[in-house]
């Protein structure tokens, strides 16, 4: 029950996180004009990963896309890439985790398969969250660097435009959304990994079946490293999930034709 709850909660938390990463990536307010010296402004600038916008006090807002790829700073391209990788990994992780959910029955899927899928999705969520956090942090670092550049023709780090009047930019709402979303995805991924441990069968206990041989009394327990025979000792203690599987170097005993069940 606790495993199902952990897995379910991990899925929900990751889902919220990935939705947040998508929202942050699409948002225009990654950087906003610094209003510290002038809290009342007639023209307010803000920028996203894909376009820059200007909002006038008249209420008129104009947004312009960055219609160049080569002209954009490498850092911005890197942030875009990190966010997209985060979204793609997260989306795949969500897809995998849906099938891995304990509460959802799909054919005769083994618990071991669900455990593997849960682990896979968990790792994907962790990497997705880390990508988002890294992307947002790289952008934030870029802003901090540009903020303290006091030259009049400061390179904005956005559209490659030269500014005649220095407009300083500070952290926008998208950064905080990205950090929180990345964190949630990361937490969700960790929860999935924890749930995976509970899903994976530690051992397979089968009911012992007694075989009465004419010469010896043997309790034969197929599979598992706890199985032992009266003929020798199992020194390997290998863990076997499939009751029928055997390793070549294991000491095995087979009932003779005279034995009966």
């Amino acid at each position: 029950m606790a495993v199902t709850a952990c897995q379910g909660l991990g899925f929900v938390v990751s889902l919220i996180g990935i939705a947040g990463i998508i929202a942050a990536t699409c948002m225009d307010q990654w950087s906003t004009q610094d209003l510290y010296n002038n809290p009342v402004t007639a023209v307010f600038n803000y920028q996203g990963l894909w376009r820059s916008c200007v909002r006038e006090s008249s209420g008129f807002t104009e947004c312009r896309g960055y219609f160049t790829l080569l002209g954009l700073p490498a850092m911005l391209q890197a942030v875009r890439a990190l966010m997209i990788v985060g979204i793609v990994l997260g989306a795949i992780g969500l897809l995998v985790s849906i099938f891995a959910l304990k509460c959802i029955r799909i054919g005769s899927m083994e618990d071991s398969a669900k455990a593997n899928m849960t682990l896979t999705s968990g790792i994907m969520f962790i990497v997705s969250g880390l990508c988002a956090i890294a992307g947002v942090s790289v952008f934030a670092n870029m802003l901090v660097t540009n903020f303290w550049m006091s030259t009049a023709n400061m390179y904005t780090g956005m559209g490659g435009m030269v500014q005649t009047v220095q407009t300083r930019y500070t952290f926008g709402a998208a950064l905080f959304v990205g950090w929180v979303a990345g964190g949630l995805t990361l937490i969700g991924g960790v929860m999935m990994c924890i749930a995976c441990r509970g899903l994976a069968p530690e051992e397979t206990n089968y009911k012992a079946v007694s075989y009465h041989a004419s010469g010896h009394s043997v309790a034969y327990k197929p599979g598992g490293f706890k199985a032992s025979t009266g003929f020798g000792s199992n020194t390997k203690n290998k863990k076997i999930y499939d009751g029928g599987a055997r390793t070549e170097d294991e000491v095995q005993s087979y009932p003779s034709k005279h034995d009966y069940v």
Epitope: A42, V43, C53, V54, S58, G59, Q163, T164
Partner: antibody, heavy 118, light 113 residues
Framework: QVQLQQPGPELVMPGASVKLSCKAS????????MHWVKQRPGQGLEWIGE????????NYNQNFRGRSTLTVDKSSSTAYMQLSSLTSGDSAVYYC???????????WGQGTSVTVSS | DIVMTQSPSSLTVTAGEKVTVGCKSS????????????LTWYQQKPGQPPKLLIY???TRESGVPDRFTGSGSGTDFTLTIRSVQAEDLAVYYC?????????FGSGTKLEIK
């Protein structure tokens, strides 16, 4: 079409106060900020302040802060400007104007002439 | 506050002539975000309220004759009237729309001979 109606001239005593009105029509009143501009006889234009009718947010020119108060009545689509402690220097034509694209004053009222005299 | 300086304060021209009115701002009116200059030109005829002519330094308001053109960037701006007509008798004002408080130039009075 957009219209800003302002009343006729006002004659007031020094030290008194006056409340000027500006009735808007032809557009959604709450969608555009209303600005007030002062023009003394034979002089240039001086920006007094603005009010956002949607939330009554105001922004004043430092020279007018304290002596002028901007308000709106959404139900009647009317903007008001109250001027207090009037002096002869306040004798002027006061215009209301609607803010538009490019932070321009695209539509103006006819103006209300205020004369401060004893 | 941004100070707007207009020149000349007045000028007298003959109908059909080309007129240029200058406007200088104490700070740049160019916004880096959209590369637009927040400089507006108004025309005020005697006994009337001002009328919007040009915004964003060079964008003509609808209904304004094409003989009126605005140019300039940063701190220096010009209003040009290609072929002055008798009805252009007015005072022309430039206005800063880039930062509060909005400020106007002192005006240029255009008179026709």
């Amino acid at each position: 079409q957009v219209q800003l109606q302002q009343p006729g001239p006002e004659l007031v005593m020094p030290g008194a106060s006056v409340k000027l009105s500006c009735k808007a029509s032809g557009y959604t009143f709450t969608s555009y900020r209303m600005h007030w501009v002062k023009q003394r006889p034979g002089q240039g234009l001086e920006w007094i302040g603005e009010i956002d009718p949607s939330n009554s947010y105001t922004n004043y020119n430092q020279n007018f802060r304290g002596r002028s108060t901007l308000t709106v009545d959404k139900s009647s689509s009317t903007a008001y400007m109250q001027l207090s402690s009037l002096t002869s220097g306040d004798s002027a034509v006061y215009y209301c104007a609607r803010l538009g694209r490019g932070n321009t004053l695209g539509y103006w009222g006819q103006g209300t002439s205020v004369t401060v005299s004893s | 506050d941004i100070v707007m300086t207009q020149s000349p304060s007045s000028l007298t021209v003959t109908a059909g002539e080309k007129v240029t009115v200058g406007c200088k701002s104490s700070q740049s009116l160019l916004n880096s975000g959209n590369q637009k200059n927040y400089l507006t030109w108004y025309q005020q005829k005697p006994g009337q309220p001002p009328k919007l002519l040009i915004y964003w330094a060079s964008t003509r308001e609808s209904g304004v004759p094409d003989r009126f053109t605005g140019s300039g960037s940063g701190t220096d701006f010009t209003l040009t009237i290609r072929s002055v007509q008798a009805e252009d008798l007015a005072v022309y004002y430039c206005q800063n729309g880039y930062s509060y408080p909005f400020t106007f130039g002192s005006g240029t009075k255009l008179e026709i001979k």
